[in-house]
C-alpha cells in the first residue's frame, strides 16, 4: 500500500529529474566559433569566411554542427546569434590598396530546403585609414534573436578579409538557444 | 486509500514546483555592473577598471560576487558575457595628449587555481579626435558565450580610462547564466 | 488499487509535462522589431522612433506588446535587451547639412505608473563624413540585462534619423526574457 505509493512517487521524482535535467542540459544547443587564421582569404572584396575553430581555446559547440564553413542548426528554436569581427592594419604589413575602406560583417542564414540565403544582421563602418598613422583598428559587434529551423545554416561574410584580426578574442561568432518554438 | 494517494500526488506536485522554481530562479546567476566614476584612473595607458556599482540604478547582482574590482563566478555554467564602454571628450575638459587614440576594451578571465589571465573578448577602434571638433564620442560593444567555473573572475581593461563616459547607461558590463555544463 | 495509482501517476506526469512545457514556452516573452522605413522622421535632431515591424520578415513578438511605437512588457522578469542601428549616406541622396555628425542610439524605459523615462543603454560615435567619399556607413550595437516590470515600455531614440538604414538586417531592437524576478 503506502510503500508501493512511495516507490511510485520516487519513480515520478526520478523520471522527472531525468527529464528536467535532460531537457535543460541537452535541449540547449550553443556554439562559439573563433577565426582560423591559417586560412583567411586575401583581397578586399566581400567573402564568406569558412575556416573557424570549434574545439580549441574559447571555441566550443554542442548540439549544433560545424561543416563546410557553416554553423548548422540541429534543433528548432529561438536563438540569440552574435558576431564580433575585428579588423586591423599595421604599416609593416604593407600598403592598403585604398585608404577609404568599407569594413563590414553580414550574418546570413541559408535554408537547404529552399536554396536561398538571407542576411539576418549587418554591421560595420566606412573608415579612412590614413598612412599618417602607424596602426589602425576597428571592431564590429552585432547580435539578435532569431527563429532557426533544423537544417538551416549560419555563415559570416566580411569585406576586406585580409585585414581581419586573427586572435580568438577578436574575431568570432556564436549562437545559443533561448527557447522552443511554440 | 484514494485520499492518501491524492496527498502523495500533492506532495509530488508541491515538491516539484519548489524544485522547478528553485532551479529556475536560483540557478541562474547574473550581474550588470555600472561604472563608478568617482574612482576612474587617469592617463592613456591600458588599465584594469576596479570600481563598479552592483546595487544602485541599473546595477544588480545575484548568485555572483563582486570583489576587488572583479566579477566572481560562484556557479559553474555557460554564461553570456557583455560589455558596453563609452569614451568621450569635450574641448572644455582640456587638450588631449595626442589626437591619435586607441580606444579599446578587453574582457578578461582570471583563474585563481592557475594564476593566469586570458582575454575572452576585445573590441575598439583607433580614432583621430581632431581639435577642430568641440565634442567627440565613441562606444564599443562586445558579447560572447563562455564556459565559466566557480572561482573564476571576470574583469575589464580599457585604454584611455580618463576618457570614459561615467554614465550608468554608457559604461557597464555584465553576465547571465544560460545553461549548466554537461 | 495499483491501477488507480498508475492513473494518478500518469496524471502527475501529464500535468507536470503541461506545466513544464507551459512555463518553458509561454513564460519566455521575446520581441525582435525591425525598422519600418515608410515612416522615418527627417532631420538631424534626436527623436523617438515609433514605426517598427513586429510580424514580417525577421520581426516577431510573443508575450510582449507593441503599441504606439513602444515595446510593452507584459510579464515581470529579467530581460536581455539589444539594439542594432545602422546609419548610411550616399552622395546621390544630397548634401549633409554638416559633415560633423553625432550618430547615437538611446534605449529608454518608461514607467506608466510613475511617468518617467530613463536611458538604459546608449551608444554611438561622432563621425566626420567628408564629401570626398561617395558613401558612408556606421553601425551601433548595444546590449544589456535589465529588470523589467509588467507595463513598462521600451523605446528607441536616435540622432540623425534621416540617415537610418531601412533594411531589416540593419536597424532593429529586441528583448528576450532570461529569468523571473525572485
Amino acid at each position: 500500500g503506502s510503500q508501493h505509493i512511495r516507490a511510485e512517487k520516487a519513480m515520478v521524482d526520478g523520471s522527472w529529474l531525468d527529464l528536467a535535467k535532460r531537457s535543460k542540459l541537452e535541449a540547449q544547443p550553443f556554439a562559439h566559433l573563433t577565426i582560423n587564421a591559417t586560412d583567411i582569404p586575401s583581397g578586399s572584396h566581400k567573402v564568406s569566411l569558412s575556416s573557424w575553430y570549434h574545439d580549441r581555446g574559447w571555441a566550443k559547440i554542442s548540439n549544433m554542427t560545424f561543416s563546410n564553413g557553416k554553423l548548422i542548426v540541429n534543433q528548432d528554436g529561438f536563438y540569440y546569434l552574435y558576431a564580433n569581427i575585428c579588423f586591423r592594419h599595421h604599416e609593416t604589413s604593407g600598403d592598403l590598396a585604398t585608404e577609404y575602406l568599407q569594413l563590414m560583417v553580414y550574418v546570413t542564414k541559408t535554408s537547404i530546403k529552399i536554396p536561398s540565403s538571407h542576411t539576418l544582421m549587418k554591421g560595420g563602418s566606412t573608415k579612412y585609414w590614413s598612412g599618417n598613422s602607424e596602426f589602425h583598428f576597428y571592431s564590429i559587434n552585432v547580435g539578435g534573436f532569431f527563429k532557426l529551423r533544423s537544417g538551416e545554416e549560419i555563415s559570416i561574410e566580411v569585406s576586406n578579409p585580409s585585414l581581419l584580426d586573427p586572435d580568438q578574442d577578436a574575431t568570432y561568432f556564436g549562437a545559443f538557444k533561448v527557447r522552443d518554438i511554440d | 486509500g484514494s485520499q492518501h494517494i491524492r496527498a502523495e500526488k500533492a506532495m509530488v506536485d508541491g515538491s516539484w514546483l519548489d524544485l522547478a522554481k528553485r532551479s529556475k530562479l536560483e540557478a541562474q546567476p547574473f550581474a550588470h555592473l555600472t561604472i563608478n566614476a568617482t574612482d576612474i584612473p587617469s592617463g592613456s595607458h591600458k588599465v584594469s577598471l576596479s570600481s563598479w556599482y552592483h546595487d544602485r540604478g541599473w546595477a544588480k547582482i545575484s548568485n555572483m560576487t563582486f570583489s576587488n574590482g572583479k566579477l566572481i563566478v560562484n556557479q559553474d555554467g555557460f554564461y553570456y558575457l557583455y560589455a558596453n564602454i563609452c569614451f568621450r571628450h569635450h574641448e572644455t575638459s582640456g587638450d588631449l595628449a595626442t589626437e591619435y587614440l586607441q580606444l579599446m576594451v578587453y574582457v578578461t578571465k582570471t583563474s585563481i587555481k592557475i594564476p593566469s589571465s586570458h582575454t575572452l573578448m576585445k573590441g575598439g577602434s583607433t580614432k583621430y579626435w581632431s581639435g577642430n571638433s568641440e565634442f567627440h564620442f565613441y562606444s564599443i560593444n562586445v558579447g560572447g558565450f563562455f564556459k565559466l567555473r566557480s572561482g573564476e573572475e571576470i574583469s575589464i581593461e580599457v585604454s584611455n580610462p580618463s576618457l570614459l563616459d561615467p554614465d550608468q547607461d554608457a559604461t557597464y558590463f555584465g553576465a547571465f547564466k544560460v545553461r549548466d555544463i554537461d | 488499487g495499483s491501477q488507480h495509482i498508475r492513473a494518478e501517476k500518469a496524471m502527475v506526469d501529464g500535468s507536470w509535462l503541461d506545466l513544464a512545457k507551459r512555463s518553458k514556452l509561454e513564460a519566455q516573452p521575446f520581441a525582435h522589431l525591425t525598422i519600418n522605413a515608410t515612416d522615418i522622421p527627417s532631420g538631424s535632431h534626436k527623436v523617438s522612433l515609433s514605426s517598427w515591424y513586429h510580424d514580417r520578415g525577421w520581426a516577431k513578438i510573443s508575450n510582449m506588446t507593441f503599441s504606439n511605437g513602444k515595446l510593452i512588457v507584459n510579464q515581470d522578469g529579467f530581460y536581455y535587451l539589444y539594439a542594432n542601428i545602422c546609419f548610411r549616406h550616399h552622395e546621390t541622396s544630397g548634401d549633409l547639412a554638416t559633415e560633423y555628425l553625432q550618430l547615437m542610439v538611446y534605449v529608454t524605459k518608461t514607467s506608466i505608473k510613475i511617468p518617467s523615462s530613463h536611458t538604459l543603454m546608449k551608444g554611438g560615435s561622432t563621425k566626420y563624413w567628408s564629401g570626398n567619399s561617395e558613401f558612408h556607413f556606421y553601425s551601433i550595437n548595444v546590449g544589456g540585462f535589465f529588470k523589467l516590470r509588467s507595463g513598462e515600455e521600451i523605446s528607441i531614440e536616435v540622432s540623425n534619423p534621416s540617415l537610418l538604414d531601412p533594411d531589416q538586417d540593419a536597424t532593429y531592437f529586441g528583448a528576450f526574457k532570461v529569468r523571473d524576478i525572485d
Partner: nanobody
Framework: EVQLVESGGGLVQAGGSLRLSCAAS????????MGWFRQPPGNEREFVAA????????YYADSVKGRFTISRDNAKNTVSLQMNSLKFEDTAAYYC??????????????????WGQGTQVTVSS
C-alpha cells in the same frame, strides 16, 4: 602619369659617401611604403632598404646595415638613401620603389607596384 625619378648617383671612391634621392610625381606616396633596390652588373636585382609611411619602421639588407640610412619627407613626396662607407661591391644601378602590396614581404621586388628608371652608383677601389 606616375613617375619615380632617382638622382644623386655617380662615381665615388671606396670609403666615401653618396646621397640618393627619389622624387615622386603623379600621385602622393606619403601613405605608402617606399624603398630602394639595386642591380649589380651581371647579377640579380636585390633589396637594399625600405621605409614605412610614418618612418617608424625601416628595413635594411644585411649587407648595408649600419652604413646606409633610408629616410623620407612626406611633405615633399621624396625618399632618400644616405650611403656611407661605400664598398666596391655597392656598385650597381639603384632603383627607387613605391607601394608595397598588402601582406607581402618588404624585401621582395615583386611586392612593389612602382619602379624608377634607376641611377648608377660606381665605387672605385
Amino acid at each position: 602619369e606616375v613617375q619615380l625619378v632617382e638622382s644623386g648617383g655617380g662615381l665615388v671612391q671606396a670609403g666615401g659617401s653618396l646621397r640618393l634621392s627619389c622624387a615622386a610625381s603623379g600621385r602622393t606616396f606619403s601613405s605608402k611604403t617606399m624603398g630602394w633596390f639595386r642591380q649589380p652588373p651581371g647579377n640579380e636585382r636585390e633589396f637594399v632598404a625600405a621605409i614605412t609611411p610614418t618612418s617608424r619602421t625601416t628595413y635594411y639588407a644585411d649587407s648595408v646595415k649600419g652604413r646606409f640610412t633610408i629616410s623620407r619627407d612626406n611633405a615633399k613626396n621624396t625618399v632618400s638613401l644616405q650611403m656611407n662607407s661605400l664598398k666596391f661591391e655597392d656598385t650597381a644601378a639603384y632603383y627607387c620603389v613605391a607601394v608595397r602590396r598588402y601582406g607581402s614581404p618588404p624585401h621582395d621586388g615583386s611586392s612593389y607596384e612602382y619602379w624608377g628608371q634607376g641611377t648608377q652608383v660606381t665605387v672605385s677601389s
